[in-house]
Interface confidence: low
Amino acid sequence: FNISGCSTKKLLWTYSTRSEEEFVLFCDLPEPQKSHFCHRNRLSPKQVPEHLPFMGSNDLSDVQWYQQPSNGDPLEDIRKSYPHIIQDKCTLHFLTPGVNNSGSYICRPKMIKSPYDVACCVKMILEVKPQTNASCEYSASHKQDLLLGSTGSISCPSLSCQSDAQSPAVTWYKNGKLLSVERSNRIVVDEVYDYHQGTYVCDYTQSDTVSSWTVRAVVQVRTIVGDTKLKPDILDPVEDTLEVELGKPLTISCKARFGFERVFNPVIKWYIKDSDLEWEVSVPEAKSIKSTLKDEIIERNIILEKVTQRDLRRKFVCFVQNSIGNTTQSVQLKEKR
């Protein structure tokens, strides 16, 4: 299709070499058409304009993304050619930074239902540069933590070296939705709730004598709780004896709850005590079975191919540890009568 009629937008992504930073492009179709596609600015029935050129379906993924090769070759479908670029609804996610992401990206509705739709497209010219020493070396992180229940702020990485006074107007998005009230280089959060977690995008406009472009940065914000003051507790096994059948296989599960820690280094292991000897057992890897903001439940199993008479004289001990301390739970096997 002819892209000469597409509206054009220039964007700059200055990525930090420090973090595995992401980037996004929104399919900013001209108003009011985009309301039919991306739902970012839904119109109520009373607001529907007199004529709607686009009568596309309300399917959120109803746009198509292409990249325009620099050598003039035909447009390429993003999904087929670029595994590190993911289309999510009307947003294009770049999973890895790099100057090779520079180029022209075009989006348009998948369904062309009227002659007006042909010119309905946006061409985004993306320039990608690594952050240089000349640019702000200690900019805000692209990963930011907010402590639940406290106050906090989310800083725009590309502007965090500038004072609030000299900062240009900033447009913020959270999970692809415009935050219309936020205009400064940081969002102040009076009280942090878990819904403040998400992907934030900050945009501001820069210009020279020739043209203007949008500088964009993406911030992953996670809401966290304070580091636990407690050692982990063992949820299972609860009993210190377990009835078993000799000669049969046996799996004993150890489940432990670990409180949140900033640097999380949980230990969960099994060892066997036999009179004065004790040794650690090689068992399958631990796995996380439940993870919440406050804690994580981790499970690790010990597997006996068949229970022997000798096993009845041993104690099987689950040992769990975090930075605060450790907890153990021992199990003695008892033959089923």
Epitope: S19, E21, Y138, K143, Q144, L147, T151, G152, V263
Partner: antibody, heavy 124, light 107 residues
Amino acid sequence: QVQLQESGPGLVKPSETLSLTCTVSGGSINNYYWSWIRQPPGKGLEWIGYIFYSGTTNYNPSLKSRVTISVDTSKNQFSLKLSSVTAADTAVYYCARDVGIAARNSYYYVMDVWGQGTTVTVSS
Amino acid sequence: AIQLTQSPSSLSASVGDRVTITCRASQGISSALAWYQQKPGKAPKLLIYDASSLESGVPSRFSGSGSGTDFTLTISSLQPEDFATYYCQQFNSYPITFGQGTRLEIK
């Protein structure tokens, strides 16, 4: 750009409390963890502890009974108090910012911005 | 606490030399290791994090490798400004610990 500046008395008497403040300029104290590290003369670095802007702390067990780190977000400052000092506490004390980085699918922290350090001597 | 042992404790080298410093952890720390450079009277400066990732603005002659318990910092071609003390640091578990340092002197 973010800069850190330690301040406090350079001389403290044995058994007294060492008090230092770190002022953060060029950026907000919010969203980050902030650490204190010390370096005795001619020796290596020792991590003392960190504080999150909300007040959550974690201390080195070797100093835990004597250390208190606090934060004042309104002044963009965080402070260190070390009680019952001895000559062994003579050192250059540094404050630093801990920045979260995404690393091989984990979330780690490194000290990317440091103050220039302040020398504290414990002597009568 | 996890102990980090650096070797050598000191070494002499000339401009243009290739230099390797090692850091051994007393237990496995995955890739949660950083390297810092410290010059006399100055604060440490972050060079490498996550064992092998180069900090922004650090010359590419510095590189790091390793995971688990054994790590190395390599300077491919020493420059006059590289003569300093180098520290490794683990941030895999509390307390955060540093190696004892390696002093790099001009031969």
